[in-house]
Interface confidence: low
């Protein structure tokens, strides 16, 4: 299709050149148009050679435009400020790990790990998440205590055709607390952080579903699920947020070979959700109350809800027995935040429209790397920033709000010709004073073009140098918001720009 368009351009340009010749146009004009025609023909020639190679990003990846980057930076800024407010340190780890480090940590998802071609003896894989590398880092450095955040790209050989809207390279934002502490205090803080971030981002109403791996395992045991089927039945239960119980039951019975009556018992439990009262009700359940694991999990959740009430976020949390996050390494509390779509009918419950953050407790992961199997209890969360980026982008598109892609505070412009030197001197002064400034890279730009660029880029101020102003020792400062224009003495300019853009004093 693009080649056809190019051929059409060549045809039109050829006709244009013939027309100019017939009209006896000037030699310069004809030469200029012939040059254009030759360039188009050259492009067509190159295009033949390029037929095989389609210029695009690899499957499941994408570029970020300046506009998207601006959105991304804002989102990251909200997240990082929250992590820092809670006293987290920051670490970084390699993009690739030894294959052995990642092996056996992700259960069924292991098939999605990217393996690298052998590079001189070391078998390597791209990291699949930030949690396993964190556990490796703790074990390797013999750390038993740290509160850290890590924002980086991870890689999954997901087939995007099967999971639309998912990427093979994407960012994760993780916060984790490692160390032996009193039960549920760090877990409650993780949930508090999740709520703070999601509230600050203002992406809509959300709900955090909470469960515990021990409750799930205990529930499966009392319902009669064989140990060997726990994990596979877990993955079926986890689909309940997307499909009906009938479909989940069919999968358990039809595909996974579970007895229908066992599935029905599971159904009685997993379709329940509520608050602390549901925890108390299940502690009285004749079957669950006899299972040690389930009782431990329920006891911890009861305590967790006490802390969530103190943190003022209990209204955002729902104990949901169908939450069964897929990763093998979770050992205790698990949680997942979903955006809510408000009900269309009065009396209906709000609908969940996809996970935007998740996490849980994984007390055994570090022990997998320690030669002596020493465990370091850990709890953490991951913010689904890719999903959040697209929600924020959607919202901006809908509101047609202009997104600034630079932080330039002032454009240095000139009203007359031959003032390039003055513009260069002034912009340099501003840079040295820590002011974010720009100028157009032309010797004699038209004032109108400079002002047009200033408006389109959304730069708050323009400093205009004119010959008369130079003689008077002033600069005209115009504001995009108020359209007012004032003469400012050259020596006061930096201070005036700072005042108008509320920038604290800072230099390079």
């Amino acid at each position: 299709a693009d080649r056809a368009a190019l051929e059409e351009l060549v045809r039109l340009q050829g006709a244009h050149v013939r027309g100019l010749k017939e009209q006896k146009a000037s030699a310069e004009q004809i030469e200029e148009e012939v040059t254009k025609l030759l360039k188009l023909k050259a492009q067509l020639g190159q295009d033949e050679g390029k037929q095989k190679f389609v210029l695009k990003t690899p499957k499941g990846t994408r570029d970020y435009s300046p506009r998207q980057m601006a959105v991304r930076e804002k989102v990251f800024d909200v997240i990082i400020r929250c992590f820092k407010r809670h006293g987290a340190e920051v670490i970084d780890t390699p993009v690739f790990e030894l294959k052995e480090t990642l092996t056996g940590k992700y259960g069924e998802d292991s098939k999605l790990i990217y393996d690298l071609k052998d590079q001189g003896g070391e078998l390597l894989s791209l990291r699949y998440d930030l949690t396993v590398p964190f556990a490796r880092y703790l074990a390797m450095n013999k750390l038993t205590n740290i509160k850290r955040y890590h924002i980086a790209k991870v890689y999954r050989r997901d087939n995007p055709a099967m999971t639309r809207g998912r990427y093979r390279e994407f960012y994760q934002c993780d916060f984790d607390i490692a160390g032996q502490f009193d039960p549920m205090i760090p877990d409650a803080e993780c949930l508090k952080i999740m709520c703070e971030i999601l509230s600050s981002l203002q992406i809509g109403n959300f709900l955090v579903k909470v469960n515990d791996r021990r409750i799930l395992d205990g529930m499966f045991a009392v319902c009669g699920v064989p140990d060997s089927k726990f994990r596979t039945i877990c993955s079926s239960v986890d689909k309940l947020d997307k499909v009906s119980w009938e479909e989940v039951k069919n999968e358990m019975v039809g595909e996974k070979g579970l007895a229908p009556e066992v599935a029905d018992r599971i159904g009685d439990y997993v379709q329940q959700h509520g608050g602390v009262s549901l925890v108390e009700q299940l502690l009285q359940d004749p079957k669950l109350s006899q299972n040690k694991q389930a009782v431990e999990g329920l006891g911890d959740l009861k305590l967790l809800f006490e802390y969530l009430i103190l943190f003022g976020i209990d209204d955002k949390i729902s104990f949901d027995l169908s939450l069964a996050r897929g990763l093998d390494y979770y050992t205790g509390v698990i949680y997942e935040a979903v955006l809510l779509q408000m009900p269309t009918q009065a009396g209906e419950e709000p609908l969940g429209v996809g996970s935007i953050a998740a996490g849980g407790r994984y007390d055994g992961l570090v022990g997998m790397f320690d030669p002596k199997g020493r465990k370091v209890p850990c709890v953490g969360l991951s913010i689904g920033v890719e999903r959040i980026f697209s929600i924020v982008e959607q919202r901006l598109e809908a509101s047609e709000e202009k997104v600034r892609t630079t932080e330039t505070q002032v454009l240095v412009a000139s009203a007359q010709k031959k003032l390039l030197e003055e513009r260069l001197k002034l912009v340099s002064e501003l840079w040295d004073a820590g002011i974010k400034a720009e100028l157009l890279y032309k010797k004699n730009p038209k004032l109108l073009n400079q002002l047009q660029y200033w408006e389109e880029a959304g730069i708050p101020l323009v400093a205009i140098i004119g010959e008369q102003e130079l003689r008077d020792g002033v600069i005209k400062l115009r504001s995009v918001a108020s359209r007012e224009e004032v003469d400012v003495r050259r020596e006061d300019l930096v201070e005036e720009i700072r005042r108008r853009t509320n920038q604290p004093l800072s230099t390079c």
């Epitope: 299709a1 095989k52 389609v54 695009k56 990003t57 499957k59 499941g60 990846t61 994408r62 997901d158 087939n159 995007p160 055709a161 099967m162 999971t163 639309r164 809207g165 998912r166 990427y167 093979r168 997307k242 779509q341 609908l351 429209v353 996809g354 697209s390 959607q394």
Partner: antibody, heavy 122, light 110 residues
């Protein structure tokens, strides 16, 4: 130029199977997915599923999951769709169409075959 | 699955007039964002792609065709109908499996 050429019309009895072929040319076969869409007489379009010859992944419309099989032969740049246990309501024109895969999402279907009429009648 | 509803079912207009076709997506879980495409089909022919991703004009399609909308409401506009534009138009999404199409809008000569 990109072309998708489909096999000729077929008349089948209820309970039989039909296999429609779609030969692609003018582009790299493994870079794009091939979707199958059908249109019953006087009706709208219905997506049946697709196959990505580059990695042999298929996506199916649950409605046809047990009866439709999509395959691709990269050596001949040909995609196939086989529909089994035919019934009279399967009488339709079956189209193959190219859908570019980009950013992990399938694009719109930009090139279509001429269609294959399958008539199911006893 | 996402249900796409096109309106009107039939649009009777004269050449030179402006045509506005609507497509609404209904889904319990999500909007289709901008993964919406428009196709034109003439009797006895295969569909032809006009607009992809809600508003991007496919190469070789005249610029009298334009698309807009995002989320759940999408519109195809033909600014001035030419004789060859009288056909049936379908919207179709590629957001999730299964892809679905609207029932179509037939644009006929008044």
């Amino acid at each position: 130029q990109v072309q998708l050429v489909q096999s000729g019309a077929e008349v089948k009895k209820p309970g039989a199977s039909v296999k429609v072929s779609c030969k692609a040319s003018g582009y790299t076969f493994t870079d794009y997915c091939i979707g199958w869409i059908r249109q019953a007489p006087g009706q709208g379009l219905e997506w049946m599923g697709d196959i990505c010859p580059g990695d042999t992944y298929t996506n199916d419309n649950e409605k046809f999951k047990d009866r439709a099989t999509m395959t691709a032969d990269t050596s001949t740049s040909t995609a196939y769709m086989e529909l089994s246990s035919l019934r009279s309501e399967d009488t339709a024109v079956y189209y193959c169409a190219r859908g570019e895969e980009q950013l992990g999402l399938r694009n719109a279907m930009d090139y279509w075959g001429q269609g294959t009429l399958v008539t199911v009648s006893s | 699955e996402i249900v796409l509803t096109q309106s009107p079912a039939t649009l009777s207009l004269s050449p030179g007039e402006r045509a506005t076709l609507s497509c609404q997506s209904q889904s319990v879980s999500t909007s289709t964002y901008n993964y919406m495409h428009w196709y034109q089909q003439k009797p006895g022919q295969a569909p032809r792609l006009l607009i992809k991703y809600a508003s991007n004009l496919e190469s070789g399609i005249p610029d009298r065709f334009s698309g807009s909308g995002s989320g759940t409401d999408f519109t195809l506009t033909i600014s001035r109908l030419e004789p060859e534009d009288f056909a049936t138009y379908y919207c179709g999404h590629s957001y999730e499996i299964p892809w679905t199409f609207g029932g179509g809008t037939k644009v006929e000569i008044k």
